[in-house]
Amino acid sequence: ATKLTEEKYELKEGQTLDVKCDYTLEKFASSQKAWQIIRDGEMPKTLACTERPSKNSHPVQVGRIILEDYHDHGLLRVRMVNLQVEDSGLYQCVIYQPPKEPHMLFDRIRLVVTKGFSGTPGSNENSTQNVYKIPPTTTKALCPLYTSPRTVTQAPPKSTADVSTPDSEINLTNVTDIIRVPVFN
């Protein structure tokens, strides 16, 4: 059966979310990658994407989001700086592979941003640092819009997963900007 797993990040306003999406296969290194938010009842929305082809260690900044693709490690680093309460939600990384539909990277990120003191977090297991320096040179990339008219769409079910969920951190699936409804046996 398909595993839809997510990992929970609980942060304070003003802190930085700093996560990595593992894309496993070298063939994906140059593929364009994107950071999306999945809001209840809506289609996944692309917030930022890398260039096409994706460049190694080259920061791309869109507003408060910085993407950096590390080909040598098979990882896409995503940072969201100066977090706001309204940033709370479910996020995912995807890989664009035209003419094929995009691939989704796991884990999904369940971000919970709360008001309060945004000093150095106390728990190493459950938090990220809030200190962040803007990269000296960043590029803004244009993100393609993928649609699949014949795809039935629906927001994915809300998961009850939390940090104790086994993490399938590098699992891939075929999705589009309009996500396919998975069929479970």
């Epitope: 595993k3 996560v19 040598d72 459950n126 590098i170």
Partner: antibody, heavy 117, light 111 residues
């Protein structure tokens, strides 16, 4: 050239503590994950845990959770394994490894930890 | 946690022969068409070396005589023609679920 060098291995008594270091060169640890893997004498490999040095987020094997703590100092490009309440069964060569595409691709030479009274 | 069982424990072969090593997982390590199963080689006194990742892809600088296959719970590492330097211990490892786990190893020794 990518290199990982572990240090800090020693002989320690049961119940004691030890901190291992893993110094990286040739890449920035903040751009990847660092894992610790151990190997008891004459035995197989055992994953200990992992850190995302940029975010500080950690994962541990159940056997060491609560006793071992993985940390990292981005500015020193070094990861650490703090081991408390050591047991004789923690005796092993400890390797730090760099992550690449879902695997542990870059390995250090290992450092020996002996827990004995 | 996912338990990986390797077989045989020891494989006695001569240089030039074909080696087939098996790794079985207690539950599937495949998802969305990718198998999160890796193979490592370890020689005495040395650190392990990545051979195969994601079940079938060779690591950097790994000779073509090494190949991997399988999905779900059953995986195979094949060495098409053993070279003298291939006699070592081989471990499978899954990166599908935390904690990551290794098989107990298969020793490939000279017959």
């Amino acid at each position: 050239e990518v290199q990982l060098v572990e240090s800090g291995g020693a002989l320690v008594k049961p119940g004691g503590s030890l901190r291992l270091s893993c110094a990286a060169s040739g890449f920035n640890i903040g751009n990847t994950y660092i894992h610790w893997v151990r190997q008891a004498p004459g035995k197989g490999l055992e994953w200990v845990g992992r850190i995302d040095p940029a975010g500080g987020r950690t994962k541990y094997a159940p056997k060491v959770k609560g006793r071992f703590t993985i940390s990292a100092d981005d500015s020193k490009n070094t990861a650490y394994l703090q081991m408390n309440s050591l047991k004789t069964e923690d005796t092993a060569v400890y390797y730090c490894t760099g992550h690449r595409g879902g695997t542990m691709d870059y390995w250090g030479q290992g450092t020996l930890v002996t827990v004995s009274s | 946690e996912i338990v990986l069982t390797q077989s045989p424990a020891t494989l006695s072969l001569s240089p030039g022969e074909r080696a087939t090593l098996s790794c079985r997982a207690s539950q599937s390590v495949s998802n969305y068409g990718i198998s999160f199963l890796n193979w490592y080689q370890q020689k005495p006194g040395q650190a392990p070396r990545l051979l195969i990742y994601a079940a079938e892809y060779r690591g950097r600088g790994i000779p073509a005589r090494f190949s991997g296959s399988g999905s779900g719970t059953d995986f195979t590492l094949t060495i098409s023609s053993l070279e003298p330097e291939d006699f070592a211990v081989y471990y499978c490892q899954q990166s599908s679920n935390v904690p990551y786990t290794f098989g107990q190893g298969t020793k490939v020794e000279i017959k």
